[in-house]
Each structure stands twice: as C-alpha cells, then as structure tokens.
C-alpha cells in the first residue's frame, strides 16, 4: 500500500549522528514517545544496549531503505556489536507502524547467538553506526 510507515523515534543523549532526517517528526499530542513518518523506506529500526541487568534503548526510527528484515511484523533483535565489555548492542528492523516501540524478546547476555565477549570492541557512538 502507498501509505507511509510510521515508527517510534528516539535518540539517547550522547548518541553521535541522527536519523531524524529519514522521516518527518509527527506531533502526536504527547511528549513521549515521539513518532516519525518515514520518507525513504517502509521500515522501522530499534537499537538496544543489553548489559547484565537491563536493556536500554539507544535509538529508534526509520531506516534509509528497505532491506532484509524489513518484512518482519515484529521487532526481533539480533546481536550486532560490543560497545564495551559486558554490553551488547541488539538491533531490529520491522515493517509495521510502531513495530519498533519494543522488542519481542532479547536473549540473555552470553547465550548462544550472542557474539562472544572477545568480539570487536567499538568506541561509544561508533558502535551505534556499526549496529545500523
């Protein structure tokens, strides 16, 4: 259908770079969560930083193009990078409105499928773009 995709938009303080121009921020009448209407794709993304005790959202928004994973109805994150020892960045892509608001499931740190702790390390901020 020709309707444009609408996603949750969030960028944690201190994150370098922005995906704000990949869509049009909407006035939804509430301060949070913010919504963004995608310009160049029908695909939302989310990035969460999983540490031993909690998962913290880093970024949510629109992707710049449709690609594998965007056909998913729900946000099913996959491990992508290690910003620091003991933490893992998980990302998802999905193709329904607000599908990136939350993830369906995150594997526990160190479980099979999670990159080993000896994996590549990235400087804070750089790791977000590695994950994208």
């Amino acid at each position: 259908p020709p309707n444009r995709r609408t996603c949750v938009f969030f960028e944690a303080p201190g994150v370098r770079g922005s995906t704000k121009t990949l869509g049009e921020l909407l006035d939804t009448g509430t301060e949070l969560p913010r919504a963004i209407r995608c310009l160049y794709s029908r695909c939302c993304f989310g990035i969460w930083n999983l540490t031993q005790d909690r998962a913290q959202v880093e970024m949510q928004g629109c992707r710049d193009s449709d690609e594998p994973g965007c056909e998913s109805l729900h946000c099913d994150p996959s491990p992508r990078a290690h910003p620091s020892p003991g933490s893992t960045l998980f990302t998802c892509s999905c193709g329904t409105d607000f599908c990136n608001a939350n993830y369906s499931h995150l594997p526990p740190p160190g479980s099979p499928g999670t990159p080993g702790s000896q994996g590549p390390q990235a400087a804070p901020g750089e790791s977000i773009w590695m994950a994208l």
Partner: antibody
Framework: QLQLQESGPGLVKPSETLSLTCTVS?????????WNWIRQPPGKGLEWMGY???????SYNPSLKSRITISRDTSKNQFSLKLSSVTAADTAVYYC??????????WGQGTLVTVSS | DIVLTQSPGTLSVSPGERATLSCSAS??????????MHWYQQKPGQPPKLLIY???SLESGIPVRFSGSGSRTDFTLTISRVEAEDFAVYYC?????????FGGGTKLEIK
C-alpha cells in the same frame, strides 16, 4: 546558496528516450534529502515523476514506472532522468527539485522538452 | 492516487482585498492528526515557489500575509491583503501517500 540546473536536448523524437541531467551546486546530493524530477505540460499542472534520495533509494510515480529511470553521479553532484518511448504527451517543462522532507523547497528553472518528429 | 481539486479555477480580486483559495482531497491527507498538504506559487516562466508546508507552516522568507489552514480533506490558502506581486497561479500538493500529487491550480488575477 543551493542551486539546481537542468540540461539536455530540447527536442526528442517520438519513441526515443528523453535524457536530462540536473547539476546541483551549493549542497552535496549525498548529504541529505531527496532529489526529484517534476514536469509540467504547457499550460497545465504539475506531475511528480520520482526521486533519488541522498542514500540512493529510488521512488517512481507508478504511472511512469515502466519508462522512467533516475540515477546519479556523485562525483559530479548530478542526478539524471531517462524517460523511454516518449510521445507528444511527454512534451513538458521538466524541473529538478530538492524535497526537504516531503515538500519541494528548491527548484531548477526548468527546461522545455518537445517531443516531435 | 489522491486527487486534489482546487477551487475556484480563477479568482479575481483587487489589490488590498482578501483572497481565499481552496484545495479538496479525494481522501484524507492526515497521518495521526498531522496534515501533509503544501502550497506553492508559480509565476509565468518561473518554477513554483514553496509558500506553506504541512498545512499551516510558513516557509522562511514568505510574507506573513500568506497563511494556510485545514485538515483531513479540506484546506485553505489565505492571502490577507493581496499585493500586486501576488497575482500568479497557486498549487496545492499532498505527500501523505505515494505518489505525491498536485492540484490543478488556481489562477489569482487582478479584478
């Protein structure tokens, strides 16, 4: 100051391919936003044809999808339009324009392309 | 495709008068209460010029006598006091759905 300038043949024969280039100065086409082609038949309204985004994503008007190709040359900061199998109905002023989000804030001056044998 | 119908086709006003131009969409151009309708002015031999975006936001450098309003399917461009330089053709454009579409235009002429 951002400027866009269309160039290409002003006369194209029926059934041939119309080719136009838009040269952008004052802004990199790989920095942000989308780069569009819009046309206007003489004395008529405007028709959005398609865009190529800063990242290379492409979107076409379905009414033209089988005939249109938009591409870019990032080294020259240019983007181009090809429209195949043209007829007299494709006679128009062709504009290139930048879309800031989903509206058009910078336009070229336009170039008239006439389809005639 | 969303069809935009502008009325009247031609509007005759005297300088200093108020001008009201309408644009009606075949279906809503709103997303979660946000209207994706934009207005342009075009003079002979020139490209269109952006006046209003997202129904009511005035583009930088455009005189405040121009204003936009409306939601869903019905939108209005108002020129509070028409000046000589305002006589031109005005187009609305929607971007709520692909493909982007334009209205047929309203010609504002001197009465």
């Amino acid at each position: 100051q951002l400027q866009l300038q269309e160039s290409g043949p002003g006369l194209v024969k029926p059934s041939e391919t119309l080719s136009l280039t838009c040269t952008v100065s004052g802004y990199s086409i790989t920095s942000d936003y989308a780069w569009n082609w819009i046309r206007q038949p003489p004395g008529k309204g405007l028709e959005w044809m398609g865009y190529i985004s800063y990242s290379g994503s492409i979107s076409y008007n379905p009414s033209l999808k089988s005939r249109i190709t938009i591409s870019r040359d990032t080294s020259k900061n240019q983007f181009s339009l090809k429209l195949s199998s043209v007829t007299a109905a494709d006679t128009a002023v062709y504009y290139c324009a930048r879309s800031r989000y989903s509206w058009f804030d910078y336009w070229g001056q336009g170039t008239l392309v006439t389809v005639s044998s | 495709d969303i069809v935009l119908t502008q009325s009247p086709g031609t509007l005759s006003v005297s300088p200093g008068e108020r001008a009201t131009l309408s644009c009606s969409a075949s279906e809503s151009v709103d997303t979660y209460g946000n209207s994706f309708m934009h207005w342009y002015q075009q003079k002979p031999g020139q490209p269109p010029k952006l006046l209003i975006y997202r129904a009511s936001s005035l583009e930088s450098g455009i005189p405040v006598r121009f204003s936009g309003s409306g939601s869903r399917t019905d939108f209005t461009l108002t020129i509070s006091r028409v000046e000589a330089e305002d006589f031109a053709v005005y187009y609305c454009q929607q971007s709520n759905e692909d493909p982007y579409t334009f209205g047929g235009g309203t010609k504002l002429e001197i009465k």
